[in-house]
Amino acid sequence: KKVVLGKKGDTVELTCTASQKKSIQFHWKNSNQIKILGNQGSFLTKGPSKLNDRADSRRSLWDQGNFPLIIKNLKIEDSDTYICEVEDQKEEVQLLVFGLTANSDTHLLQGQSLTLTLESPPGSSPSVQCRSPRGKNIQGGKTLSVSQLELQDSGTWTCTVLQNQKKVEFKIDIVVLAFQKASSIVYKKEGEQVEFSFPLAFTVEKLTGSGELWWQAERASSSKSWITFDLKNKEVSVKRVTQDPKLQMGKKLPLHLTLPQALPQYAGSGNLTLALEAKTGKLHQEVNLVVMRATQLQKNLTCEVWGPTSPKLMLSLKLENKEAKVSKREKAVWVLNPEAGMWQCLLSDSGQVLLESNIKVLPTWSTPVQP
């Protein structure tokens, strides 16, 4: 007997062909011999089966001796053997209906687990293989689990169900809720305005939740909440903000924070958390601020950086267009009795300048000028 696989919620068309290319009498019945549908002349008649309102045919095909049975909005329990009676012949078709669903929401937080559950008719023994958007294959039986979802797992998962050498394909759209970057670093000279941006890696029509930025300043013994805010339908409203520093926050997405001035006491690292409505867990993004200051006190020219710098970063002091006078993998460098001219303080990583501050050293009889 012919085997046809169907998907829950879909439509299936079972074919039945007579040898005569004309409209003749036919009937479709289920395995309990209950009539589903048939014809009376050129009109469709329906029987008392449970499929009554979901069964149909294509009358335009009857003249060619084709008498399809269409079943709409398939249910797992529609799995059965269907019999087409035409010209004193019986054609049997076994229909197996499968369903594949994500047993939680399809919008999941980064790091959470995805479980896909296969619904199948009794007596079937299907195998399932799913391919993630990044090409990772997972196999299983009735359930498939993927732990620790990553940002690259966002997108369409294609799952193939195999049964009786036949296959049916399911596509499930998964959205991994995360920030675009897990961590970011902002390098600023003392006194400059600082912009922190927290773009999301997903788009949803309505986004509601609340968030907070905790800050651990390098100079402070404990962390402190700098700002708390609410998010309602993508609109941001500040709930509470510290007096020092007085952060400003953009009213629209992406989440955007402005620190009026970069000061050494603010250098450090922060953790922005976002709790979304109806979701367990939170989204996190780490943000780091490195602040540079170049000063001249009496005969000492000093360059300092505060904040989380990697040990491989190089701090240098050099007179413009000349070789570096001093270059160290440290957070402070200085030059005694610097000669007059424009000095540059550079923070660099493998030759790439991350931060630069210029200071003008005047001849010894005058005071220094900082541009």
Partner: antibody
Amino acid sequence: EVQLVESGGGLVQPGGSLRLSCAASGFTFSNYAMSWVRQAPGKRLEWVSAISDHSTNTYYPDSVKGRFTISRDNAKNTLYLQMNSLRAEDTAVYYCARKYGGDYDPFDYWGQGTLVTVSS
Amino acid sequence: DIQMTQSPSSLSASVGDRVTITCQASQDINNYIAWYQHKPGKGPKLLIHYTSTLQPGIPSRFSGSGSGRDYTLTISSLQPEDFATYYCLQYDNLLFTFGGGTKVEIK
């Protein structure tokens, strides 16, 4: 001879409503699924709604869902299309079409159409 | 929704010419394609359904072929009354969609 005659078209303001009718003759109306198809000026034909022979099922594309309602009166051999919240892009010639038989069959007979103009 | 791409959008031909119009579906439509002829001021007329089944009363110079996603309407020898616009229709699922039409004009 199968005949389908549409009526009820005309000029209507955006946001307004209109009800189209289609009088059917020459066949047993209650045995056929029916449809409305439209053609905007210079555009392709666009199917806008369908109804099964005994009104069990109705179908609409997303472009009109929630605004248009198809219905039929088998005793009067008439098909209707109630159009609400009309937009400029609904301006078109609206055709009443008979399906070959059921919901899944193509259109085999069409009326001559009635023009609906949505403009302020 | 299934998209139907019809080509050409217009063509000029002479009486007696062989004319071919194609329609490509965005996915397999299982031969559920119909072809219509449309003349100004009238309703469209069904020529062919189920890829190649000719409607009663339609001249045999009209024929249809194809499978999967690609389908063709052929007029073997164009007659004066055949100058019109032709549309394909997919009816594989309940959201019927038409091709953009092909206007057949006199050369």
